[in-house]
Amino acid sequence: MKVLQEPTCVSDYMSISTCEWKMNGPTNCSTELRLLYQLVFLLSEAHTCIPENNGGAGCVCHLLMDDVVSADNYTLDLWAGQQLLWKGSFKPSEHVKPRAPGNLTVHTNVSDTLLLTWSNPYPPDNYLYNHLTYAVNIWSENDPADFRIYNVTYLEPSLRIAASTLKSGISYRARVRAWAQCYNTTWSEWSPSTKWHNSYREPFEQH
């Protein structure tokens, strides 16, 4: 049994880091493998993660962490029984993938304006809470070419757009994702999408 693709990990900079790797053949990850991780610091504790299958030869493990600070560094040991398959380290602050925003809502009751709001995925006491910016993706269910991205570079988790910038009388979907420049993070996963019917009054043309 060998590791074909070494573990790569990302942290949500809150409580979970996710590590993925591939073995050289079909593996029952949860019965055959264990990923041990330990904070490199005084009197730290070794933890064991039981991986799950992620495709035939792929494994994924969700490492629970009580808190994350920028200096944190973890040792990682991948074991198959008594055999050490791989040894490495992981610094969560250098591999951050934020949590996905939630509760995306489209408010259509404001006159000819669409107000999209969503929830910041972090509690106020988390460092990332005040450092997230967002991308909102809006697309038409009827026209695949009608696909747009709005970058929200301010902290407030909301976006206002004129309903007239979208076609009237058709259904649209929206989703949102987050990233944090301060840690040069990757983008989060997209939030679940939400659907609405776009309709607005055409401006009266005077001749």
Partner: antibody, heavy 119, light 107 residues
Framework: QVQLKQSGAELVKPGASVKMSCKAS????????MHWVKQTPGQGLEWIGG????????SYNQKFKGKATLTADKSSNTAYMQLSSLTSEDSAVYYC????????????WGQGTLVTVSA | DIQMTQSTSSLSASLGDRVTISCRAS??????LNWYQQKPDGTVKLLIY???RLHSGVPSRFSGSGSGTDYSLTISNLEQEDIATYFC?????????FGGGTKLEIK
């Protein structure tokens, strides 16, 4: 809410030993470290050392090696510190303080145990 | 050992004031700087850890900042219950060491 309950004040003679306790109201004691801190008017706060109750690992301030011995009883979520060969210099308030395992900040503190060394 | 210096041993301020308490380390401590509050009855509480992280349950009027060797604790709107002695502590290098404390009093 985590609470640390320390044993009561001690009046001891020079040359004697004293053992104080600190009981933690936590679910899994083994996920924490228990540290001890000395406070005197002259020296202020001094870190004595810490213990991982799960595996018994300890770390001591060199200044207190041979003076303090840290132990724990996992079954009762209780940590102990024994001070030996007491002198008047050991008269102080001693605090137990809890950190999450491997952390350098004392998240919760006991109320303190006053030790007075006097003939 | 790393020396932690709180140059102001006592400080008088009025209720509602913005108060800043400073702490200097004798060498770089890489943000491993924590702040504690000790009430007159001896009760000690963690306020700020790792330079600027607010410990759970601590009012948001407390904040911390700094880097390298220089750090500070700020109380943005002083309240009566904040009357206490404040200690800094470094957790970067063994043995962990504390500052001498800054006693905060009401004018």
């Amino acid at each position: 809410q985590v609470q640390l309950k320390q044993s009561g004040a001690e009046l001891v003679k020079p040359g004697a030993s004293v053992k104080m306790s600190c009981k933690a109201s936590v679910n899994t004691f083994t996920g924490y470290n228990m540290h001890w801190v000395k406070q005197t008017p002259g020296q202020g706060l001094e870190w004595i050392g810490g213990l991982h109750p799960g595996n018994g690992d300890t770390s001591y301030n060199q200044k207190f090696k041979g003076k303090a011995t840290l132990t724990a009883d996992k079954s009762s979520n209780t940590a102990y510190m024994q001070l030996s060969s007491l002198t008047s210099e050991d008269s102080a308030v001693y605090y137990c303080a809890l950190t999450t395992a491997g952390r350098a900040w004392f998240a919760y503190w006991g109320q303190g145990t006053l030790v007075t060394v006097s003939a | 050992d790393i020396q932690m210096t709180q140059s102001t041993s006592s400080l008088s301020a009025s209720l509602g004031d913005r108060v800043t308490i400073s702490c200097r380390a004798s060498q770089d401590i890489s943000n491993y700087l924590n702040w504690y509050q000790q009430k007159p009855d001896g009760t000690v509480k963690l306020l700020i850890y790792y330079t600027s992280r607010l410990h759970s349950g601590v009012p948001s009027r407390f904040s911390g900042s700094g880097s390298g060797t220089d750090y500070s604790l700020t109380i943005s709107n002083l309240e009566q219950e904040d009357i206490a002695t404040y200690f800094c502590q470094q957790g970067n290098t063994l043995p962990w060491t504390f500052g001498g404390g800054t006693k905060l009093e009401i004018k």
